[in-house]
Interface confidence: medium
Amino acid sequence: EEELQVIQPDKSVLVAAGETATLRCTATSLIPVGPIQWFRGAGPGRELIYNQKEGHFPRVTTVSDLTKRNNMDFSIRIGNITPADAGTYYCVKFRKGSPDDVEFKSGAGTELSVRAKPSAPVVSGPAARATPQHTVSFTCESHGFSPRDITLKWFKNGNELSDFQTNVDPVGESVSYSIHSTAKVVLTREDVHSQVICEVAHVTLQGDPLRGTANLSETIRVPPTLEVTQQPVRAENQVNVTCQVRKFYPQRLQLTWLENGNVSRTETASTVTENKDGTYNWMSWLLVNVSAHRDDVKLTCQVEHDGQPAVSKSHDLKVSAHPKEQGSNTAAENTGSNERNIY
């Protein structure tokens, strides 16, 4: 009679993570008598996967009833596959012996490859805000995918970015992989509404890439421009001076009026107007009683924006001359309307 052969017909099997893998194995003879075992890997370091004789195998089931006398099908199913299950599986026939069974013949092996989806990309930006014209770095991470081949792209408002560096780890063979990418983005004043997108494409995603996003509103700081203007006389001895704070982001802003260097009033921006580009405008008024001053008055509008060093703009109010409309010129645009007549 021809000697028993162990046949593993599938050289390789590809399974998606979470699914069930079927590893096929048949013997060509019932002789010699002895159990079948399945191992992952070969040699002394192999891992026992299934033992016909004894053991507890919660994820492994046999395809046919191994207790039947004439059974020659030793195929198994492994449930809830993870990338850690990848490897070459050998179906091994043992010959009954005393005291120990003896390995008799092994199948050629079936390589189990596991396809695992990458995790949703997580995009993170710099810890501190930056101003327009500065370059900031964004990172994108995704984990747990297999096989190793993966494509990552960066976009800003739908436009693909080119200044980025990507690494896939580990470099060698592994059950699953991670990707880490860093992109450099130059900020502009119009970026309050902008978005940076990291897009990951992998064979497991069937052409529907995963995306992670970061809003540049979390990253950008647009410093304000200031303009101080003297308004027409409201009463014989009163002059209205306005400080227009334009195009700033985020909203956190504190304004202080100084008269000849002395603090007159401090207020926090509350009722702001929003520009189309997402920046804000705000206006503060100061009513000055010129009869209380003998000499010319230097009025300063000092603004502290988002915890940054204060910026200021001054206006000289001539007391000797009859108050006329005067002002300092800076580009005016889309004024706000927080009108507070406080002296």
């Epitope: 992952r40 891992e47 026992l48 033992n51 016909q52 507890h56 492994i78 299950d85 069974d101």
Partner: nanobody, 124 residues
């Protein structure tokens, strides 16, 4: 080289439960079959339970089947032995073992690495 440290032993009444833990350091335990042996006073060391490196297969000595459960957490390099319905004859020093050695299809007979052991006493 692998270092193994057992914990969780102690005194328990018959019918009670204990959970033993074994922490592996040195070589990654996820590349090794691991298990538990025990040695009662005046007796030889005997196999209790074993688990393959990924946890896909486990094996138990007959007298422990249904009462003991072995499991592992490769991320933490830990192996556990949950012991329920304990009997006085389970009193022994329990040893964690790594790189179990098999012969044929029998249960593990030996190991390449051993812990110091943790005492389990079952008495009323």
């Amino acid at each position: 080289q692998v270092q193994l440290q057992e914990s969780g032993g102690g005194w328990v009444q018959p019918g009670g439960s204990l959970r033993l833990s074994c922490e592996a350091s040195g070589r990654t335990s996820s590349s090794l079959d691991m298990g538990w042996f025990r040695q009662a006073p005046g007796k030889e060391r005997e196999f209790v339970a074993g688990i393959s490196r990924t946890g896909i297969s486990a094996y138990y000595a007959d007298s422990m089947k249904g009462r003991f459960t072995i499991s592992r957490d490769n991320a933490k390099n830990l192996v556990y032995l949950q012991m329920n319905s304990l009997k006085s004859e389970d009193t022994a020093v329990y040893y964690c073992a790594a790189a179990l050695t098999f012969r044929g299809s029998d249960l593990p007979r030996d190991s390449n690495y051993w812990g110091q052991g943790t005492q389990v006493t079952v008495s009323s």
